[in-house]
């Protein structure tokens, strides 16, 4: 039978009264058009609508927008036009909403041409009131608040500008001209590049990368002939041209541009790219595009200071047209990561790291499901999931995959179960152990959502026809009800709950049609009533992450330590609540080899957990590039796996001599940077 | 030559199944998958299904899911399609056709190749 | 599912002359279509795969084009032989689907 229709499927007492008193319908007075929504900080139930509407006149488009504010998290909605004029507000720069709680938004409004600059609206109040401000430039991308003061804006005109406002949008100064790419990194410094001759476009690969650290009183250049550059984690990246000819490597650094290394990864040409897939505080993963229009590369994992890499994935897909890619961090449990790799015959494969991106395996069938006509066989195949590149290719997947980090271990994602990604309609699948093991959720694509903490799992059928039926589950996914929230269908088109999946309360989005208009309505669900009771001590069970051999003294040990959970018990029914804080208790582990990443010039044999040395590099002195010198390694293959805890146990030695010989291939060696005051 | 070779003509009463096979020759049958399309007197054409001759794995059209079964027997090279519950709308020729792509969703670079070798037809009528 | 649609149901062409066939798909099949021949009794036989490649051993007359939704069939001098029903065919998203047939018929 269908996941959800087994007899041993309990049901929830008199949902359909308790869901029914929380049912809020909110009609929209406008004209379907466009609409977008925004959360106003956390817990804080204001949610932003913006409808936009474009009438097209016979010389021209007319357009016609309406702001909406909701503090109940959906419930009921106030229209606050007025508050902002009445004017018509830019959609492609969306609602710039300030960072953690400040209760900044930033509205960009259309203005006639030939005006001076562009117009904004500011709110530092949960939107209760706005402020109308004229700028002295028009802006070319969204406002860009710095992570630590919200205060601090920045944003690139359509004149190639820096505009930076230290008053929350008040007043603007242009910083700097002839600026391509500007970002924030920490403690309020500014990066950007810097075009010379024509624009951003024809100096592609002569840029400069500059750094201002006071918001534009002075300027270091701190990297010359750039193409691009990125920040991810503590670490950042530019790819630099090389002297010779019109291939680029990647430079990195550690202490926001002062000095620089090179990244021991391969140099790309014209055509190919580099890509940061993930970074944290400890690593990176790096994408590096093969060469030609392959549309795959090569996954590489990066050594606690980013330059010495690992080959991690062969194969991975990540197109050159769309830039699509599949690689996904799944957020719900430590080191495990997903991904899609194209295989030889040119079908397209997922596959799974547990160990940040030391070993890929594939997908574990799931239980409940038959293999498909992908399988070579019957009885053994994989689960194959679909993410962005599925959805590129307009396949019939509505979501990419979902984790939170506060539901643990649990993974939500359309799939197939065969030898490779199936263009056929594919079903939903739930992981709730951080995708070891798998289970058919739901029968054909639809919508999902996890609100408190996991405590509840919300889907919707994908559907071209109306619809009025949201379908939930208590249980992770094992039982399904189905509730009809309103009698007239709608043509639905999302839904919204609050980021952080803590909230209880799920909005239906979607728009009515009848024979002379259409207007958008929502339905806001609150479930606090389905959970009627605090969880409790007793609703919590104990449970081992990576735990594949409970008779292993080391089960469970992933980058050197274990971590035990208390988790929500399947059979109870109870708020975990907007506090719930995942309570874990970590534990170290002895060092084995697999707590070693293979050290520059060594690789691992597949099935092997040795490291052995690359046959081309066999005999040679390792050498690598470090802040501009040359350094020479002695190792006997090995190096800790960054953010691996693990003590005692295998120690393999690993030993750098400074050469102190200077490194010709590296570009940004700090003679070449200069500083500079306005 | 590559050919697909189909059984004969079949008569049925509603509500009876009928198997039509189809033997292929001519090329490696496990290197490439096999497509079940029928056409009704006078009306189009409709795809059935999709079978991997490694391993029998299958796909279907919504439509017959429940009621239609496709196997092979690779010491043979021949796939079967059997449809079950049989109503006069399933009054139709069934064509079985070699598939080269299968359904898996391709990379970047690819593109469909076609049903490029098709069976003779089997005639099945539905007729109480 | 993706729905195929051709035009026209009928089209009358003189031998010699050029004859141009539509078909569209409800949403983007990118260059996964093929066009399929089938003349009375007998099976389909395959045209044209990947929108705009020529199967083995058919004749150069033929020709495919387009890419996304729209796309087009077109034989630029018609022989005798080549008065038959003509479907286009999708595998971009599963089930296949065929359109509903163009007969070219003697004018």
């Known amino acids: 039978s269908a996941p959800g229709e087994d007899e041993e499927c309990g049901r929830v007492r008199d949902f359909v009264a308790k869901l029914a008193n929380n049912t809020h319908q909110h009609v929209f007075d406008d004209l379907r058009g466009s609409v977008s929504l925004s959360w106003v900080g956390d817990s804080t139930g204001v949610i932003l609508v913006l409808t936009t509407f474009h009438v097209p006149l016979v010389i021209m488009t007319f357009g016609q927008s309406k702001l909406y504010r909701s503090e109940d998290y959906g419930k009921n909605f106030k229209d606050i036009t007025d508050l902002i004029n009445n004017t018509f507000i830019r959609t492609e720069f969306g609602m710039a909403i300030g960072p953690e709680n400040s209760g900044k938004v930033v509205l960009t409004a259309e203005v006639s041409g030939g005006s001076r600059g562009g117009r904004i609206f500011r709110s530092s109040d949960f939107a209760k009131n706005f402020v109308q401000t004229d700028l002295p430039f028009h802006p070319l991308t969204q406002m860009m608040y710095s992570p630590q003061n919200s205060d601090y804006l920045l944003a690139l005109s359509t004149e190639n500008g820096l505009w930076v406002s230290k008053n929350f949008g008040g007043k603007w100064e242009e910083i700097h001209k002839a600026v391509c790419l500007a970002k924030w990194g920490s403690d309020n410094t500014i990066f950007f590049t810097t075009y010379a001759n024509g624009s951003c476009k024809a100096d592609l690969g002569a840029l400069e990368l500059w750094r201002t650290s006071d918001l534009g009183k002075s300027f270091k250049t701190i990297g010359v002939k750039i193409y691009s550059f990125g920040l991810g984690g503590r670490f950042l990246f530019a790819s630099v041209m090389a002297d010779k000819d019109t291939t680029r490597r990647i430079h990195v650094s550690t202490d926001q541009g002062d000095t620089w290394s090179m990244a021991q990864l391969p140099s790309v040409g014209q055509e190919q790219f580099y890509s940061i897939l993930a970074a944290n505080d400890d690593m990176v993963f790096m994408h590096v595009d093969e060469p030609g229009d392959t549309g795959f590369g090569t996954i590489f994992t990066s050594d606690d200071r980013g330059i010495v890499y690992s080959k991690s994935l062969d194969r991975h897909l990540y197109t050159t047209t769309g830039g699509e890619t599949d690689f996904t961090n799944v957020t719900s449990l430590r080191g495990v990561y997903i991904t899609s790799v194209l295989s030889e015959d040119n079908s397209i494969q997922t596959m799974i790291t547990f160990d940040q991106g030391g070993r890929w395996t594939h997908l574990r069938k799931p239980e409940n499901s038959e293999c498909d006509a992908t399988a070579k066989n019957k009885n053994e195949c994989s689960l194959h999931i679909h993410a962005s590149y599925s959805i590129s290719q307009k396949l019939n997947v509505p979501m990419a995959p979902l984790s939170e980090p506060n539901a643990v271990g649990i993974v939500i994602a359309h799939g197939s179960v065969g030898d490779a990604i199936s263009v056929m309609v594919p079903d939903v699948y739930i992981s709730d152990d951080g995708g070891y093991s798998w289970t058919k959720m739901l029968e054909g694509p639809h919508y999902y959502t996890i609100l408190d903490s996991g405590g509840i799992i919300v889907a919707i059928e994908h559907s071209s026809r109306p619809i009025n039926v949201i379908k939930f589950s208590t249980d992770e996914g094992q039982c399904w009800q189905t509730y009809t929230f309103t009698r007239d269908p709608i043509y639905f088109t999302g839904l919204a709950s609050e980021p952080g999946a803590r909230s209880m309360n799920i909005s239906i989005w979607g728009f009515t049609e009848s024979f002379l208009t259409s207007q958008w309505v929502s339905y806001t669900i609150d479930f606090k009533d389905i959970l009627e009771r605090n969880c409790e001590e007793k609703d919590y069970t104990i449970w081992l992450a990576h735990s594949t051999d409970p008779e292993d003294y080391e089960d469970g040990c992933i980058l050197g330590y274990k971590e035990q959970f208390l988790r929500l018990r399947k059979s109870s029914v109870c708020q975990n609540g907007r506090d719930y804080v995942v309570t874990k208790q970590p534990s170290i582990c002895l060092c084995s080899l697999e707590d070693f990443l293979c050290d520059f010039g060594y690789y691992r044999p597949e099935n092997d957990s040795k490291c052995v040395e690359q046959p081309e590099l066999k005999g040679h002195d390792l050498e690598f590039c470090l802040y501009g010198r040359e350094e020479h390694l002695t190792t006997n293959g090995y190096r800790k796996i960054p953010g691996d805890k693990c003590q005692g146990g295998v120690n393999p030695v690993r030993e750098v001599k400074d050469l102190k010989k200077k490194c010709t291939s590296n570009f940004l060696s700090p003679e070449k940077q200069n500083s500079k005051s306005n | 030559q590559v050919q697909l070779v189909q059984s004969g003509a079949e008569v049925k009463k509603p509500g009876a199944s009928v198997k039509v096979s189809c033997k292929a020759s001519g090329y490696t049958f496990t290197k490439y998958y096999m497509s079940w399309v029928r056409q009704a007197p006078g009306q189009g054409l409709e795809w059935m299904g999709i079978i991997n001759p490694i391993g029998g794995s299958t796909s279907y059209a919504q439509k017959f899911q429940g009621r239609v079964t496709m196997t092979r027997d690779t010491s043979t090279s021949t796939v079967y399609m059997e449809l079950s519950s049989l109503r006069s709308e399933d009054t139709a020729v069934y064509y079985c056709?070699?598939?080269?792509?299968?359904?898996?969703?391709?990379?970047?670079?690819?593109?469909?190749?076609?049903?490029?070798?098709w069976g003779q037809g089997t005639t099945v009528t539905v007729s109480s | 599912e993706i729905v195929m649609t051709q035009s026209p149901a009928t089209l009358s062409v003189s031998p010699g002359e050029r004859a141009t066939l539509s078909c569209r798909a409800s949403?983007?099949?990118?260059?996964?279509l093929a066009w399929y021949q089938q003349k009375p009794g007998q099976a389909p036989r395959l045209l044209i795969y990947?929108?705009?490649t020529r199967a083995t051993g058919i004749p150069a007359r033929f020709s495919g084009s387009g890419s996304g939704t729209e796309f087009t069939l077109t034989i630029s001098s018609l022989q005798s032989e080549d008065f038959a029903v003509y479907y286009c065919?999708?595998?971009?998203?599963?089930?296949?689907?065929f359109g509903g047939g163009t007969k070219v018929e003697i004018k």
């Open positions: 949403q983007s099949v990118s260059s996964n």
């Open positions: 065919q999708q595998a971009r998203l599963g089930p296949w689907t």
């Open positions: 056709a070699r598939d080269p792509s299968g359904i898996a969703l391709a990379g970047p670079a690819s593109r469909y190749y076609g049903m490029d070798v």
């Open positions: 990947g929108a705009s």
